[in-house]
Each structure stands twice: as structure tokens, then as C-alpha cells.
């Protein structure tokens, strides 16, 4: 069985205010079986930011179609990007159970906001 | 809610094909993977066929591969599955069904009959 | 294949769990379908191994563990008489399969 790795290939991503941010995910594997999720942050304080079992997420959208059964592409895109969204985000793959439990991280992902041009 | 509508069944004889169609209410179709599922006579439920929620992505069962092609108008809110080469064997209550994240079904159609009978 | 029980019964009250093996737990999520009358439409009681839908009471319960799945209705009624048909997804094969059926009776 081939051993699932998640690569964010952007260590960095800097987006205006106001604009979109896309964050690159793909996975090698498609075992264990469960769901993606995205976070901001790490350790307890972290922030959900999107969840592929659970929904809507208003602000977030894949880039790939998810409903596709061998789709490996969790990529998102965040629309109108505020300097609160600002931090690492991170892709991570949880391993079905009662409940879900984390089985692998993405690097991570550092998105920076610049001010809106004027 | 949640509504699923069948339609499109009927008497036809062996060799001849027939178009089911399930409408959909109540929810983003567009955002969903659906499949077809049918019950034979005294028998039990068999899947089908499915497709992803943007139609570009569709998956068979072995024994109807070829035959059955299954489909889906965003714009109308519609699932279809033509069926050619109709045998006996297939004379059955048809259902739509819309899938969950992972491919398993929350909401299913009331069904419609196919009869296959020279 | 997923293979299940033909039939269980019970007593009003009492618990009864309803188990389908076959699948593999790395790779395979599991749903549970309840059917009233041949020809009628299935109603999802679990789907995702153990994620109930709102509209279900919650005396239904769903649990997956190696290869096996088990449906749990605690506390079972007299309107729980139906056939219940499990079902599984596995991401090897990107195909759904379906046990044969468990003929609920209620006494």
C-alpha cells in the first residue's frame, strides 16, 4: 500500500485584501479513507477552515471538483481575503472513526495580506 | 427539502431502450455526486451507475457497463439514465439518489418501474 | 460482498444489532438503508458508518470496526419492521455494494 503524503507545495502565498487566496493540496493516496480538512494555525487555538464532510463553508471553495471518487486535489480558494485571514494553513488528512481521527499534515501554508492598492 | 422524482418508466420489450429521468428539489444539485440504484422483483438493491456533481466523472457497475449511461442537466436539475439493450433482467423499480461526501446515499427518489416483457 | 443476516427479531424494547462484513476498513465507508415494503423507497438510517440523519430517531446506531459494520436500534418498535440493506462504498474500486437484506421482525 502506498503510504498517503500530503504536499502544500507553496511554503508562502501573499494576497491582497480583497482579493482571492488559492491553497495548493494534493494527496498521494487515497487510503486510509476519511476526510480533508484545513486549518489555520496549530495546537489547540487552531481554526476550522474548511471540512470535506461538513458544510457550507461560505468564504471557501475547492478548485477541484471533490465529488469526483478518485479525485486527490483538495485545494481551496478563499474569497476576499481581510489581514485577519493572515497565518499558515494547514491540510490535513483525518482517518475514519468514532471519532475522525488526524492521520497527516501538509507542511503548511504561510499566507501573508498585503494592504489593498489604492 | 429534499426532493427526488423518477420518471420516464414503463413497459418496453427486450432489445429496445428506455431514458429515466429524476428531477431534483430542495438542495444545490450542482454541488452533488447522485447515482442510480434498482430492485428487482423480490431481490434486493443494486447500484448502478453514479457521476460526479459537475458530470464530467461517471462510474458503472460491471454488469451494465456499456448498456446504461448515466447523465445530469445542471441547468434543469436533472439526472437521467439511458438504458439500451433492455434484457428481462433488468425489469425493476429504478431510484435516484443523492450521495454524501463519500459516495454513500442520504436521499433517495420514490422510484419508478421498468418492465421488460415481450 | 457484503454479507448480513437474512432475518432477526426481537421483542418490543429490546436491542438489536444487525451486522455486515466484508468490507475493508481502510478503504470502505458503510450506510444502512431501511425499507418498508418491496418496491417502496429506502430511507437512510445511517450513513458514513455511524453519522445518523436528523430526521432519524436515535434509538439507530451505527458503528464500523475491522471489517464488519453493525446497526444498532435500541430499544426497538413495532413500526421498525422493515428490511434493512447495508451498503458500502469502497475507494479501491469506486463501486457501492449492497448486502442482500435483514428481514426485521418485531414480535
Known amino acids: 500500500e502506498e503510504e498517503l503524503q500530503i504536499i502544500q507545495p507553496d511554503k508562502s502565498v501573499s494576497v491582497a485584501a480583497g482579493e482571492s487566496a488559492i491553497l495548493h493540496c494534493t494527496i498521494t493516496s487515497l487510503f486510509p479513507v476519511g476526510p480533508i480538512q484545513w486549518f489555520r494555525g496549530a495546537g489547540p487555538a487552531r481554526v476550522l477552515i474548511y471540512n470535506q464532510r461538513q458544510g457550507p463553508f461560505p468564504r471557501v471553495t475547492t478548485v477541484s471538483e471533490t465529488t469526483k471518487r478518485e479525485n486527490m486535489d483538495f485545494s481551496i480558494s478563499i474569497s476576499n481575503i481581510t489581514p485577519a485571514d493572515a497565518g499558515t494553513y494547514y491540510c490535513i488528512k483525518f482517518r475514519k472513526g468514532s471519532p475522525d481521527t488526524e492521520f497527516k499534515s501538509g507542511a503548511g501554508t504561510e499566507l501573508s495580506v498585503r494592504a489593498k492598492p489604492s | 427539502d429534499v426532493q427526488l422524482v423518477e420518471s420516464g418508466g414503463g413497459v418496453v420489450r427486450p432489445g429496445e431502450s428506455l431514458r429515466l429521468s429524476c428531477a431534483a428539489s430542495?438542495?444545490?444539485?450542482?454541488?452533488?455526486?447522485m447515482s442510480w440504484v434498482r430492485q428487482a422483483p423480490g431481490k434486493g438493491l443494486e447500484w448502478l451507475a453514479g457521476i460526479s456533481a459537475g458530470g464530467s466523472d461517471t462510474y458503472y457497475i460491471d454488469s451494465v457497463k456499456g448498456r446504461f449511461t448515466i447523465s445530469r442537466d445542471n441547468s434543469k436539475n436533472s439526472l437521467y439514465l439511458q438504458m439500451n439493450s433492455l434484457t428481462a433482467e433488468d425489469t425493476a423499480v429504478y431510484y435516484c439518489a443523492r450521495e454524501t461526501w463519500n459516495h454513500l446515499f442520504d436521499y433517495w427518489g420514490l422510484g419508478t418501474l421498468v418492465t421488460v416483457s415481450s | 460482498a457484503l454479507t448480513q443476516p437474512a432475518s432477526v427479531s426481537a421483542n418490543p424494547g429490546e436491542t438489536v444489532k444487525i451486522t455486515c462484513s466484508g468490507g475493508?476498513?481502510?478503504?470502505?465507508?458503510y450506510g444502512w438503508y431501511q425499507q418498508k415494503s418491496p418496491g417502496s423507497a429506502p430511507v437512510t438510517v445511517i450513513?458514513?458508518?455511524?453519522k445518523r440523519p436528523s430526521d432519524i430517531p436515535s434509538r439507530f446506531s451505527g458503528s464500523a470496526s475491522g471489517s464488519a459494520a453493525t446497526l444498532t436500534i435500541t430499544g426497538v418498535r413495532v413500526e421498525d419492521e422493515a428490511v434493512y440493506y447495508c451498503?458500502?462504498?469502497?475507494?479501491?474500486?469506486?463501486?457501492?455494494?449492497f448486502g442482500a437484506g435483514t428481514t426485521l421482525t418485531v414480535l
Open positions: 450513513h458514513s458508518d455511524d
Open positions: 430542495g438542495f444545490t444539485f450542482s454541488s452533488y455526486a
Open positions: 451498503a458500502g462504498y469502497d475507494g479501491r474500486t469506486y463501486i457501492n455494494t
Open positions: 475493508d476498513w481502510y478503504s470502505t465507508y
